[in-house]
Interface confidence: medium
């Protein structure tokens, strides 16, 4: 059911763009899943607007979202996780716009954490490691990670490395000597589930050794 409000109180609704986007997070709180939706136009007047999800739910036909400032949010165990759900923006009982969405195709993983970089002097390389909560999950276990690093002075010159493991080796000779680097990592579903990049992990900063003049190697 989609359409626009037609009664007198809701005439202004016809002028608004109620486009919205959503992402799901599975087993984000124990066995609880979450679904977060927000309007694409930040200036939409959200007073009296509600979100509702129907279909592909266990035990119930529909669920209402909670409103948290400008986002709408559900935390539940009741997502079926196979099949499309109908997500609607509503004013009272009237649906203003609806989207059919399979929650397994809009998964946003949790951000990786515990990012660290260790310099191995003998190997002349840097070992990057990080952790992800998804290793312990039943559903979204398989992720592709995007490690991005840059020299701190090069504001937009990021180098990206995609990997499926949580460990990466950076060769010393590929980095500038005596430089401060920033590194961060994010994740995206990479098997049965589809969706969006997670938020970036907190950045980690490390300095490369200076060049040893006699050997041409970094200290």
């Amino acid at each position: 059911e989609s359409g626009y409000a037609q009664n007198g109180d809701l005439e202004d609704a016809e002028l608004d763009d109620y486009s919205f986007s959503c992402y799901s997070q599975l087993e984000v709180n124990g066995s609880q899943h979450s679904l977060t939706c927000a309007f694409e136009d930040p200036d939409v007047n959200t007073t009296n607007l509600e979100f509702e999800i129907c279909g592909a739910l266990v035990e119930v036909k529909c669920l209402n979202f909670r409103k948290l400032q400008e986002i709408y949010f559900i935390e539940t165990k009741k997502f079926l996780l196979i099949g499309k759900s109908n997500i609607c923006v509503k004013v009272g009982e009237k649906s203003l716009t609806c989207k059919k969405i399979d929650l397994t195709t809009i998964v946003k993983p949790e951000a990786p954490f515990d990012l660290s970089v260790i310099y191995r002097e003998g190997a002349n390389d840097f070992v990057v490691t990080f952790n992800t909560s998804h290793l312990q999950k039943k559903y979204v276990k398989v992720l592709m990670h995007d490690v991005a690093y840059r020299q701190e002075k090069d504001e937009n010159k990021w180098t990206h490395v995609n990997l499926s493991s949580t460990k990466l080796t950076l060769l010393q000779r590929k980095l500038q000597p005596a430089a401060m680097y920033e590194i961060k990592v994010r994740s995206i579903p990479d098997h049965y589930f589809k969706g969006f990049w997670s938020e970036w992990s907190p950045s980690y900063y490390f300095r490369t050794p200076e060049i040893n003049n006699s050997s041409g190697e970094m200290d």
């Epitope: 266990v58 036909k61 996780l81 196979i82």
Partner: antibody, heavy 121, light 109 residues
Framework: EVQLVESGGGLVQPGRSLRLSCAAS????????MHWVRQAPGKGLEWVSG????????GYADSVKGRFTIFRDNAKNSLYLQMNSLRAEDTALYYC??????????????WGQGTTVTVSS | AIQLTQSPSSLSASVGDRVTITCRAA??????LAWYQQKPGKAPKLLIY???SLESGVPSRFSGSGSGTDFTLTISSLQPEDFATYYC???????????FGQGTRLEIK
């Protein structure tokens, strides 16, 4: 009118293959998971296989795993069951069924009339 | 897959009787249960979903109840057209899996 029409059944020798088809009409096919359910003569219902709307979720009963393959063509509004290495115990009436998960979870709200598969030498 | 056991396997009753069929799950499945009716030579027909919700077009003499492991299908006053075989059904969403009970045959006494 919502309709499912199965075809492709017949008499086949043990070890041979058969492909069942199910033509869907009257509903938005690619919004729904679909299933195959069979019923041996004089026996109860046995779920055989199911496939999600986008073919990414697929399941099989243990009795057919590794021998049967379910697939769908949303452009043709069609569901298929490829049955290999057929055995006498696969003899049954095979139903195609539409999944209506808006009911709250997997419920099979529309069924075809069935197609008969007989495996015998 | 979760095992579903229906009881009785068959029963005889008369028109006007109140009939109860039970379905027991080997482990808790909350309210994720449906009931179907099948008449000889016909495809099954959905009666009840979500343990107690009546499918559109199904007479109100049919009702379902229960949650967890024990579920019941009740026909409050048997009509001649109700003599058939009844099946309960459960699901698992990941991996996708459906299980039927073995069926209960309801015959005219």
């Amino acid at each position: 009118e919502v309709q499912l029409v199965e075809s492709g059944g017949g008499l086949v020798q043990p070890g041979r293959s058969l492909r069942l088809s199910c033509a869907a009409s009257g509903f938005t096919f690619d919004d729904h998971a679909m299933h195959w359910v069979r019923q041996a003569p004089g026996k109860g219902l046995e779920w055989v296989s199911g496939i999600s709307w986008n073919s990414r979720g697929i399941g099989y009963a243990d009795s057919v795993k590794g021998r049967f393959t379910i697939f769908r063509d949303n452009a043709k509004n069609s569901l298929y069951l490829q049955m290999n290495s057929l055995r006498a115990e696969d003899t049954a009436l095979y139903y195609c069924a539409k999944d209506e998960y808006s009911r709250g979870y997997y419920v099979l709200d529309v069924w075809g009339q069935g197609t008969t598969v007989t495996v015998s030498s | 897959a979760i095992q579903l056991t229906q009881s009785p396997s068959s029963l005889s009753a008369s028109v006007g009787d109140r009939v109860t069929i039970t379905c027991r799950a080997a482990q808790g499945i909350s309210s994720a249960l449906a009931w179907y009716q099948q008449k000889p030579g016909k495809a099954p027909k959905l009666l009840i979903y979500d343990a107690s919700s009546l499918e559109s077009g199904v007479p109100s003499r049919f009702s379902g109840s229960g949650s967890g492991t024990d579920f019941t299908l009740t026909i409050s006053s048997l009509q001649p057209e109700d003599f058939a075989t009844y099946y309960c059904q459960q699901f698992n969403s990941y991996p996708l899996w459906i299980t039927f009970g073995q069926g209960t045959r309801l015959e005219i006494k």
